[in-house]
Amino acid sequence: IWELKKDVYVVELDWYPDAPGEMVVLTCDTPEEDGITWTLDQSSEVLGSGKTLTIQVKEFGDAGQYTCHKGGEVLSHSLLLLHKKEDGIWSTDILKDQKEPKNKTFLRCEAKNYSGRFTCWWLTTISTDLTFSVKSSRGSSDPQGVTCGAATLSAERVRGDNKEYEYSVECQEDSACPAAEESLPIEVMVDAVHKLKYENYTSSFFIRDIIKPDPPKNLQLKPLKNSRQVEVSWEYPDTWSTPHSYFSLTFCVQVQGKSKREKKDRVFTDKTSATVICRKNASISVRAQDRYYSSSWSEWASVPCS
Amino acid sequence: RNLPVATPDPGMFPCLHHSQNLLRAVSNMLQKARQTLEFYPCTSEEIDHEDITKDKTSTVEACLPLELTKNESCLNSRETSFITNGSCLASRKTSFMMALCLSSIYEDLKMYQVEFKTMNAKLLMDPKRQIFLDQNMLAVIDELMQALNFNSETVPQKSSLEEPDFYKTKIKLCILLHAFRIRAVTIDRVMSYLNAS
């Protein structure tokens, strides 16, 4: 058993039918010695008396808010949560496996630049009685500071019969140098509590590996005289690290017809302009990627050909 | 500790091309190592990230763009002094700081070159003959060093009398390649910045 926060405790259980569970001793936080009784949750049934209460925690029915009283007055509370270990592996019931970029990916994180700021998000089908708390650091043995905000519900979508809820959090490394070569990964730890179930999820990454630039901005077309060709131009996104000559991007320009089946023409360039043939009803899209370290491409910025 | 924004002559920067070749070569070699050594811990998540140049060179700090010198987090650097007779810039206006940066890059390349050559000698003794260093990568390191053209003492190749542990050697190869790829990215950024300056 360990303390998650004041008066909230996590009991780790080897989870299998007929498991013996864990013996837990609760102590009433009071100078009083006599006349103390214990109850669980809203029940008025007295579980025991005395300054300490010994319980065998086996299942969720044994978890909850234990309260010690004296003469009708509440003295203190202890909330017991359960953390299930199933055949040597901690349970992952609360969050959905996003399966990207690989199986058992519960937390996904992205950064728009090298400033040390990043966003993580996760998915669940649970709508109520759910709380998250996020901590982060650079490295784990001698951790350096990363400050995370509160996790917030960022999207809701319907998937088949189920509703899916997306939560996200923003974090900022306390002293980040954009040009630094990372040798210790960022660690992100999410504590999830659903009713009386506790779970924790972690992700470990280098900022360089989670970079995804914003799409190029100010995408414009300039028709070339006496030609079906157009000059496409764009600019680096505002959120990208500066100077751009040091943090350079490379670009992919795509001409896409109205039908998805039509052949796509693609051009790759390090410049912020390109000359392409504009077909009728087609659109021109441009996306960006770090020129020197192949992390994710940005989303497309698009303009119609007409 | 930073690169001043100079206005040298156009087309004066032969190192840019070499540094791009270097990044391509080390990235290809790392990919080959990951595939060939699939049953070894060779991915970024599995290896320890070691920097053989740590406390010996200070490329990131010496080559910091002027715009980032206002960022306090970028300035907690180590002090290192280098030889300053680089010829990568055709211009005579090479500042002391730029020379410091380029000589730091040269020292990095020299250190990695020695490590890779020593390692290749061990890998050639492996009866499995599973993986060797790409000669193209070694040649590209050499070309960039020549383009930087710094006079520096030659570091003798390390020789080891004891029987090599091939498993450990292959894991060390992965560690070295990951670190060298990261350094090659920094070198490419620096060359791009200098080329634009």
Epitope: P17, G88, K104 | -
Partner: antibody, heavy 115, light 112 residues
């Protein structure tokens, strides 16, 4: 005392269907994941399928994916394996078992696919 | 397809020490715990070892398990006639848990 009692096995022709049941008692069935495992005559153990405690996630071996469906009825404390498009190579003793570091196995039920 | 490899058979005389190996990879045994089962003819498998080296109550202490890197082994010190059975190791793959992997199985024969 944890008990898993299996039923539903038998002889079936190739291409036909069969449903196996596994009735659980002596524990809170709705709190635990469950597996199906099979063993062809004279062969080793082969994992078939798994279902989470609440039925929200199901996993299958590649050899049965698309043909077999694992399900559970927590109100009846029963686990099921619906087997469709049966093949000769599905002939085996099928076992249900609980998920956890200590597991409990059913007695097994024989499924024979033969024309 | 089996990813956990065991020798098809091992044998020993009563009182001898018999060991069975189970060879896997970094993503299964290297990342997860191992179980061992004993299966007597015509019966369901019985758990002998969980968590690499833990014995459930009721399992004789002549059975012991260990794990090193990507391999695991089961040892029977002082093998007895009633130990003649099939033995299976079991683990998970870190990317596909709870998909379960069983070893190929080993027939233990007690001679004479």
């Amino acid at each position: 005392q944890v008990q898993l009692v299996q039923s539903g096995g038998g002889v079936v022709q190739p291409g036909r269907s069969l449903r196996l049941s596994c009735a659980a008692s002596g524990f809170t069935f709705s709190s635990y994941g469950m597996h199906w495992v099979r063993q062809a005559p004279g062969k080793g153990l082969e994992w078939v399928a798994f279902i989470r405690y609440d039925g929200s996630n199901k996993y299958y071996a590649d050899s049965v994916k698309g043909r077999f469906t694992i399900s559970r009825d927590n109100s009846k404390n029963t686990l099921y394996l619906q087997m469709k498009s049966l093949r000769a190579e599905d002939t085996a003793v099928y076992y249900c078992k609980t998920h956890g570091s200590h597991d409990n196995w059913g007695q097994g039920t024989m499924v024979t696919v033969s024309s | 397809s089996y990813v956990l490899t065991q020798p098809p058979s091992v044998s020993g005389t009563p009182g001898q020490r018999v060991t069975i190996s189970c060879s896997g990879g970094r993503s299964n045994i290297g990342s997860n715990t191992v179980k061992w089962y004993q299966q007597l003819p015509g019966t369901a498998p019985k758990l002998l070892i969980y968590g690499n080296d833990q014995r459930p109550s009721g399992v004789p202490d002549r059975f012991s398990g260990s794990k090193s890197g990507t391999s695991a082994s089961l040892a029977i010190t002082g093998v007895q006639a009633e130990d003649e059975a099939d033995y299976y190791c079991q683990s998970y793959d870190r990317g596909t848990h709870p998909l379960t992997m069983f070893g190929t199985g080993t027939k233990v024969t007690v001679l004479g």
